[in-house]
């Protein structure tokens, strides 16, 4: 049932011991009760007791205070039960009877008689306070209380409401003394059978099934499954989205696992040789006279550098070497002569000048000639003077050195940033690469520069769905989406179950 | 959309040769650098080439060098590894892949992968 009308009786006196019809009951009056529950009557009529009806056994004898009693014969207050939303209003009809028989069942027995009867119309709410109430007539008087309650698990002002507590997959709730659920703690919902996961767990890419807990969606990791997990193989990148692999700075190739600064973190080259960060394995050397191999790890032999003079032939020996000296010269080097200018010893149109009394002399040596007798045409690359993969080109009398992209100065010793000098308009982003910088333009800008502004802006009519972002530039009228994770098409339209290795991401 | 479908993948006995095709849409194909990458089973991927936007900087893993060649056409947004003197060890699922930006570095958006077998 819904609830319970409860009738608590508390004393019953019948001084003289008589019964209604004016006879008195020998030796007293053996007394039970017949209680009759029914909607509510203007004018109480008899017929069936429409909420319920309960009789006492004997309770006592003409005058008796009734105790309290919760279980068996003689229940003190009756309970009569009722499975309907209870209307607010009922007539209660309490009779007092004698009976000489059973006093256990007296209900049965032939003989009864009216003591007698009391009749209560009105309307009672449902709670917990009882009503008391006292009823006297000429022979009688009747002390009772009376209650409206709802049984276990139906609430609410007519005990309509049903709730009972759970704490399984259903719900995980109490119940309000109005009947509405109170989630247990770490629930939530209608029903309080939604989890709240642990705070700060990620809207979309976490999820939980139980309170204070956060999984993580495919591609996403971290306790609060904020962190996108990078693609599988990525050394030294980060990514934005899922399975991304963004090159931190320095770092290059698909798996960012290319040293892009290979000279300054591994100083591979030896012997003062000068480290570019280029050529196939990420850098080159370039070596000092004297030195060779792919990092200048290798002395040439001592002769290298040619140092006999004077046509002198240069013969290795171990720690140094021996110039052997044409005739005429002299000396370690061949440089000390046994000719004058009488010999006419300066070759290529150089001027003879004598020396000690002209025992000796020196050549002077017309443009792009030199050596001890003007024997050597000039060649000024001879040294390697350009840095960083520079070329060196003889120019008449000087040397230039003609500078890879993204190398400056005399001998190509400055790198320069294509960046340095913003060569992107309208705020477009720079990114230098080996053969000049390459500019990512914002929305209504392009061009190699972004200096051409888009007169329709192709994303202006927000044509992307579900969050992505929308990029034009890449042709003038047309449009990019870049989808969020999840979602795929020309418009980031649908939906996708990513695979779970190599999912496409839009 | 970004798109990159790839093809040419197929058994092959070692030492011989086969040009892998990677197709292109969806994007202004001059923009990205465009590299192939390969998984085996049970291993981590290897990057094994990358072509600048340009098509003047061009690398390769250690393993592939002098041996597989990338290239690209612009006209037919396509890139192509050719693959000469293959060995069992190059057996694995190839992928083309670009980072969504001019230099090679890193990766952004790749295909479905195409399978190939070097085995006698």
């Known amino acids: 049932g819904s609830g319970i009308f409860q009738l608590r009786l508390q004393e019953f006196v019948n001084q003289r011991g008589m019964l209604a019809n004016g006879q008195s009951c020998e030796p007293g009056c053996r007394t039970f009760f017949r209680i009759c529950l029914k909607h509510f009557q203007a004018t109480f009529s008899e017929g069936p007791c429409t909420f319920g009806n309960v009789s006492t056994p004997v309770l006592g004898t003409n005058s008796f205070v009734v105790r309290d009693k919760n279980s068996g014969s003689g229940r003190n207050p009756l309970q009569l039960p009722f499975n309907f939303t209870w209307p607010g209003t009922f007539s209660l009809n309490i009779q007092a009877w004698h009976t000489p028989g059973d006093d256990l069942r007296p209900e049965t027995s032939p003989g009864n008689s009216l003591i007698s009867q009391i009749i209560i119309q009105g309307s009672l709410a449902v709670g917990k306070i009882w009503r008391t109430d006292e009823q006297n007539d000429t022979l009688t008087r009747l002390s009772y209380s009376y209650r409206v309650i709802c049984s276990d698990n139906y609430y609410g002002e007519s005990c309509s409401r049903l709730c009972k507590k759970r704490d399984d997959h259903f719900g995980h709730y109490e119940c309000q003394p109005d009947g509405s659920l109170s989630c247990l703690p770490g629930w939530t919902g209608k029903y309080c059978d939604q989890p709240i996961c642990l705070s700060g767990c990620h809207e979309q890419n976490g999820y939980c099934s139980k309170p204070d807990e956060c999984i993580c969606r495919p591609g996403w990791q971290g306790r609060l499954c904020n962190e996108c997990i990078p693609h599988n193989g990525c050394r030294h990148g980060t990514c934005s989205i899922p399975w991304q692999c963004a090159c931190d700075e320095g770092w290059g190739g698909l798996f960012c696992d290319q040293d892009l600064n290979y000279c300054t973190h591994h100083s591979p080259c030896k012997n003062g040789s000068t480290c570019s960060n280029s050529g196939p394995k990420g850098y080159t050397c370039t070596c000092l006279p004297g030195y060779t191999g792919e990092h200048c790890e290798l002395g040439l032999s001592k002769c290298a550098s040619n140092p006999c003079r004077n046509g002198g032939s240069c013969k290795d020996q171990e720690n140094s070497y021996h110039c052997l000296c044409p005739p005429g010269y002299y000396g370690q080097h061949c440089e000390h002569s046994t000719l004058t200018c009488a010999d006419s010893p300066c070759f290529n149109g150089g001027s003879c000048r004598e020396r000690n009394q002209g025992s000796s002399y020196a050549c002077e040596c017309p443009p792009n000639f030199t050596g001890s007798n003007c024997e050597k045409k000039v060649d000024r690359c001879t040294s390697n003077p350009c840095a960083n993969g520079g070329q060196c080109q003889n120019r008449g009398p000087s040397r230039t050195c003609r500078c890879r992209p993204g190398f400056t100065g005399t001998h190509c010793e400055l790198h320069i940033s294509d960046c340095a000098r913003s060569p992107c308009a309208h705020g477009g982003t720079c990114h230098d690469l080996e053969n000049g910088p390459v500019c990512t333009c914002p929305a209504g800008f392009s061009g190699r520069r972004c200096e051409v502004r888009i007169t329709h802006d192709a994303c202006a009519s927000g044509p992307c769905f579900n969050g992505a972002t929308c990029y034009t530039g890449l042709s003038p009228n047309n449009f990019v989406c870049n989808c969020p994770y999840g979602f795929v098409g020309s418009r980031c339209e649908f939906p996708v179950g990513l695979p779970p290795s190599f999912p496409w991401v839009a | 959309e970004v798109q990159l479908v790839e093809s040419g993948g197929g058994l092959v006995q070692p030492g011989g040769s086969l040009r892998l095709s990677c197709t292109a849409s969806g994007f202004t194909f001059d923009v990205y650098a465009i590299g192939w990458f390969r998984q085996a089973p049970g291993k981590e991927p290897e990057g094994i080439s990358c072509i600048s936007s340009s098509g003047s900087i061009t690398y390769y893993a250690d393993s592939v060098k002098g041996r597989f060649t990338t290239s690209r056409d612009s006209a037919k947004n396509t890139v192509y590894l050719q693959m000469n003197s293959l060995k069992p060890e190059d057996t694995a699922v190839y992928y083309c892949?670009?980072?969504?930006?001019?230099?090679?570095?890193?990766?952004?958006?790749w295909g479905q992968g195409t399978q190939v077998t070097v085995s006698s």
């Open positions: 892949a670009t980072p969504g930006i001019a230099a090679c570095r890193g990766i952004h958006y």
